[in-house]
């Protein structure tokens, strides 16, 4: 199947150790959880925990598995056909704009606005104008109501991997 | 002679299609992997897609993946790049090239067409 | 992805002269290095694979070196049909090209 190329760190070279599984390549690519040989002629498997390939490939290294940072916590394991899934803890968010770290979500709506979206590992909390029902653009207010957020559940891969 | 001659090329609206191909002869097409690599107006190469010899897998970069597909007919010696929801950041020249055998890179490519998406 | 950092991006030669050409990858690549020949309105000519082996056909003249992140092109001679522009890439992480670099007679 068609591939998104993750942006991950390759792990060292992996030189066929005993615990490394090859097999031949399928009309010369490598199925995923496997990258293909120096020489094209084998497939060799990635190292469960330590690399992985998520799409039928040439890599010649499998790609490094990430690790959640401080602030994340890991929602499923990287396996050799799928990288780490990482999330923001309770009562943070990853933007699109910043990808790179977990901002807090806001405690509280500003004055004459009222909260309609819950803090999600990926979404501040959404505040609309009681009246108008326009949203708010994000930024910090000078006075905050005490409108306590929740996390939201769902989750939100730290590396996408297609 | 390994020969690899890609047609297909011209003038697109952003967000239109085409459909680009290349005619391999000189070598037994249907035991290569095939690409499709492009050059930029500023003369940037990026790889755009890759295929299996026998066709039945690919893969793609995140710049193109979902709206470019690559497909070939082994029979026809043929190579396909179907481009749809084209952007201006498309405009390139598009060559086809063939994996070596035994060095996991390419080793001959074809002229080019050159695509240029524009209103 | 893997950049591959270039240079320099054009240099000035006379026939005869010693070129080096260099490329650095942001990341190991091992021996995953090729270097390719481009003329003006051509297709770009593979001269080296795995760093440092030469391509059926491409001169003597034309070497490759390193390894990890740092790669040469030497062309120990320059003859009049070697002015063009070099690239460099990477393969061991799908394929990323370096940004060129320009020969031109002094």
């Known amino acids: 199947e068609s591939a998104l190329i993750t942006q991950q760190d390759l792990a060292p070279q992996q030189r066929a150790a005993p615990q490394q599984k090859r097999s031949s390549p399928s009309e010369g690519l490598c199925p995923p959880g496997h990258h293909i040989s120096e020489d094209g002629r084998d497939c060799i498997s990635c190292k469960y925990g330590q690399d992985y390939s998520t799409h039928w490939n040439d890599l010649l290294f499998c790609l490094r598995c990430t690790r959640c940072d401080s602030g994340e916590v890991e929602l499923s394991p990287c396996t050799t056909t799928r990288n780490t899934v990482c999330q923001c803890e309770e009562g943070t968010f990853r933007e699109e704009d910043s990808p790179e770290m977990c901002r807090k979500c806001r405690t509280g709506c500003p004055r004459g606005m009222v909260k309609v979206g819950d803090c999600t590992p990926w979404s501040d909390i959404e505040c609309v104008h009681k009246e108008s029902g326009t949203k708010h653009s994000g930024e910090v207010p000078a006075v905050e109501e005490t409108v306590t957020s929740s996390p939201g559940t769902p989750a939100s891969p730290c590396s996408l991997s297609g | 002679e390994v020969m690899l001659v890609e047609s297909g090329g011209g003038l697109v609206q952003p967000g239109g299609s085409l459909r680009l191909s290349c005619a391999a002869s000189?070598?037994?097409?249907?035991?290569?992997?095939m690409s499709w690599v492009r050059q930029t107006p500023e003369k940037r190469l990026e790889w755009v897609a890759t295929i299996s010899s026998g066709g039945s897998y690919t893969y793609y970069p995140d710049s193109v993946k979902g709206r470019f597909t690559i497909s070939r007919d082994n029979a026809k010696n043929t190579l396909y790049l179907q481009m749809s929801s084209l952007r201006a950041e498309d405009t390139a020249v598009y060559y086809c090239?063939?994996?070596?055998?035994?060095?996991?890179?390419?080793?001959?490519w074809g002229q080019g067409t050159l695509v240029t998406v524009s209103s | 992805d893997i950049v591959m950092t270039q240079s320099p991006s054009s240099l000035s030669a006379s026939v005869g002269d010693r070129v080096t050409i260099t490329c650095k990858a942001s990341?190991?690549?091992?021996?995953?290095v090729a270097w390719y020949q481009q003329k003006p309105g051509k297709a770009p000519k593979l001269l080296i694979y795995?760093?440092?082996t030469r391509h059926t056909g491409v001169p003597d003249r034309f070497t490759g070196s390193g390894s990890g992140t740092d790669f040469t092109l030497t062309i120990s001679s320059l003859q009049p049909e070697d002015f063009a522009t070099y690239f460099c890439q990477q393969y061991s992480s799908y394929r990323t090209f370096g940004q060129g670099t320009k020969v031109e007679i002094k």
């Open positions: 990341q190991d690549v091992g021996t995953a």
């Open positions: 000189g070598f037994t097409f249907s035991s290569y992997v």
């Open positions: 795995w760093a440092s």
């Open positions: 090239a063939r994996r070596g055998d035994s060095m996991i890179t390419t080793d001959y």
